[in-house]
Amino acid sequence: AKLGAVYTEGGFVEGVNKKLGLLGDSVDIFKGIPFAAPTKALENPQPHPGWQGTLKAKNFKKRCLQATITQDSTYGDEDCLYLNIWVPQGRKQVSRDLPVMIWIYGGAFLMGSGHGANFLNNYLYDGEEIATRGNVIVVTFNYRVGPLGFLSTGDANLPGNYGLRDQHMAIAWVKRNIAAFGGDPNNITLFGESAGGASVSLQTLSPYNKGLIRRAISQSGVALSPWVIQKNPLFWAKKVAEKVGCPVGDAARMAQCLKVTDPRALTLAYKVPLAGLEYPMLHYVGFVPVIDGDFIPADPINLYANAADIDYIAGTNNMDGHIFASIDMPAINKGNKKVTEEDFYKLVSEFTITKGLRGAKTTFDVYTESWAQDPSQENKKKTVVDFETDVLFLVPTEIALAQHRANAKSAKTYAYLFSHPSRMPVYPKWVGADHADDIQYVFGKPFATPTGYRPQDRTVSKAMIAYWTNFAKTGDPNMGDSAVPTHWEPYTTENSGYLEITKKMGSSSMKRSLRTNFLRYWTLTYLALPTVTDQEATPVPPTGDSEATPVPPTGDSETAPVPPTGDSGAPPVPPTGDSGAPPVPPTGDSGAPPVPPTGDSGAPPVPPTGDSGAPPVPPTGDSGAPPVPPTGDSGAPPVPPTGDAGPPPVPPTGDSGAPPVPPTGDSGAPPVTPTGDSETAPVPPTGDSGAPPVPPTGDSEAAPVPPTDDSKEAQMPAVIRF
């Protein structure tokens, strides 16, 4: 069976029907359907006016405008808000009421596209394998990134979050139109990785998506990750304004000037250093979501009541921090270079700025405890990786899971750890699953490009597709049309259960209390340390253009360079065309399948590190499980990122006069705001009033936006406000 042309709100669209084998199965593929009008710089997306005739949806459209890996030119286009759909078809009747899975790509909110890197005409985010193996509809789409997607003045002049609103427009388009493609508009699952995983998380928390999302999967990124929320957007807006010659004294004039500046100039005005960094790489990621008082009405830690009815899977890779650690400390991947105590202490101190000397020392002591018994370079390098994995991914994900569980009504919660080792031949043998290593398996690359993979890789891919698509169908990864290798138990605050995903899975794959000692350290011990408010706690950023080095790889393999293997410290420069040959991915997640390691398995899967493979010691107390992390604004552990040393600004609530009007925007219904019950909902950050966070006010032109403290504008905001 095949769909032929489909009538959407924009008009008729015609895709391609691709036959699969001799049994009559096929997949209908639609590429490049507009879900919003061509964008205007630094403006919210608008509905597409539609078209006449039949749109031939047969080719991917250009990605949204972004810098090339060398950061000296741009590619992509301002007209970029398009989506792609894969619909599996049986032999006889066209599909009806299929679950829908919407992918949100990663790339540090700075780069990426809905189709991903291309290798042998197979795109990383090609939905065919998931769709046909799992019998689900797969949707991918583009959203604005970098300054064009996330530049904000921290007030109503430029509220920011344009890229998040693009994502919402795509989700809402799917809700309204997917029935015509054979999808069930009441069974939409979001899934995404890295910044895409965080975006999934943020979309579930935004009141604008009330009633749109049934389930969600966050891979290596949640709303609470320390690189997700920009607490000092004006600092970064001014940096760009200065570069393009806009006035910075008055926010309104600056905003008007930025809106009429050549979008390419805006894009190139922001450069991320990759080599010779003075501070950890994540300090330099400036254009990310903000708490705008509308789309994201309050600190994400206080919005989990909005996701109370959404089934949720979240997890990380066991060495998610490896690629970042290897940029921050290049010795990690070099057998002839050593990591010293001094190196690690410096790194730790840069991540713990807001807690001053005590924060650095206690953190250093906790992480180097094993060094006395095992002073080997391998152990020390693993420690650095574990540290960055914990801070950037694992701890925030654990907190997000606990928050979801604590607020959930009917919704289920599941946790996983992906440990199938990286296949990058240039990496040391001890490296586990690096950041973005999971993507290739979720998207079925071992089946789509089999020559680059081994049978064990296909086993992992089959299992992940089965779990992911079963979950999309039923809300339970064990139940659906696909057989799974072992039962995945839900996460609860009592058991902290998680599934370890490896090539050999059985009953022992279900584990408990991942790295509990470190989770408890960050959420209890570290949190209790006094915050240093001294201005010296915030590092000064490099200001020159000398650091115009490649963008750090953060999830979209198509733009991620191979980690350096020589002594130069600089990665090779890949091609820069929009559709040319992709750079070699750092993590085997895409394009060129990496050279298989010699031997049967390559590096063995690394057990959850830091606890010597032994089950972590449960915390003291009655429950035998880690406590649910503090939920008030003052108690968001490694979560709230990139603020000044002081507390984050709070959206105006209650004291600013009359309460805002409930939303009239795209939400579809009044937003859910956290309830006041501290047992299940985080304490709202509203000072003394005790009132819940402000709901969105509909039109972001007039949205309340939290004030930003600009008194330290000359300084670089710390990326983590631990």
Partner: antibody
Amino acid sequence: QVQLVQSGAEVKKPGASVKVSCKASGYTFTSYNMHWVRQAPGQGLEWMGVINPGDGYTSYTQKFKGRVTMTRDTSTSTVYMELSSLRSEDTAVYYCARDYYGSSPLGYWGQGTLVTVSS
Amino acid sequence: DIQMTQSPSSLSASVGDRVTITCRASQSISYLNWYQQKPGKAPKLLIYAASKLPSGVPSRFSGSGSGTDFTLTISSLQPEDFATYYCQQRSSSPTFGQGTKLEIK
């Protein structure tokens, strides 16, 4: 100027079929989608489906799938709507309407055709 | 399908009055159109894309709203404005509101 002229009133028995025509003039016939909307006596408007006169692609609302067929004749710039297995509740005025621009507003309407289904 | 609910179902007003009709969608929609229909006549497009006026429509008609809540306003009623008004949403299966009958008081 844009004109949509529909065929005359029809009286049909239950179980029969009716075919209503809509002749377009004043614009390029194949460039705009044509919709069919019906209105039962004293009731509101109900969208039935749409045809692209350029390639003949159609889309029908779930309620009418299997009973309605929309076709076009480019040589005469005419679209047709055939409704089968008529029942008394199909008694209504049937309108053809052309897109105004883009894909949404129905900017130009025919005068309507009354179809009465009665035994 | 997306349900469209208009309010009020009917209303009486006098020439010169300012009149407001609302339309609420059961979920967020991208575009909303308004039509005017007089007895025995075909509907006429009044406003499209929530707030845009087709050529020939008097400026006393205006529309606003986004997401789920929309409004049609007639700033100063004229005798020829007494009619039934329908809202319509655009999706893969367009639907109309049940109509609002505007009568002379």
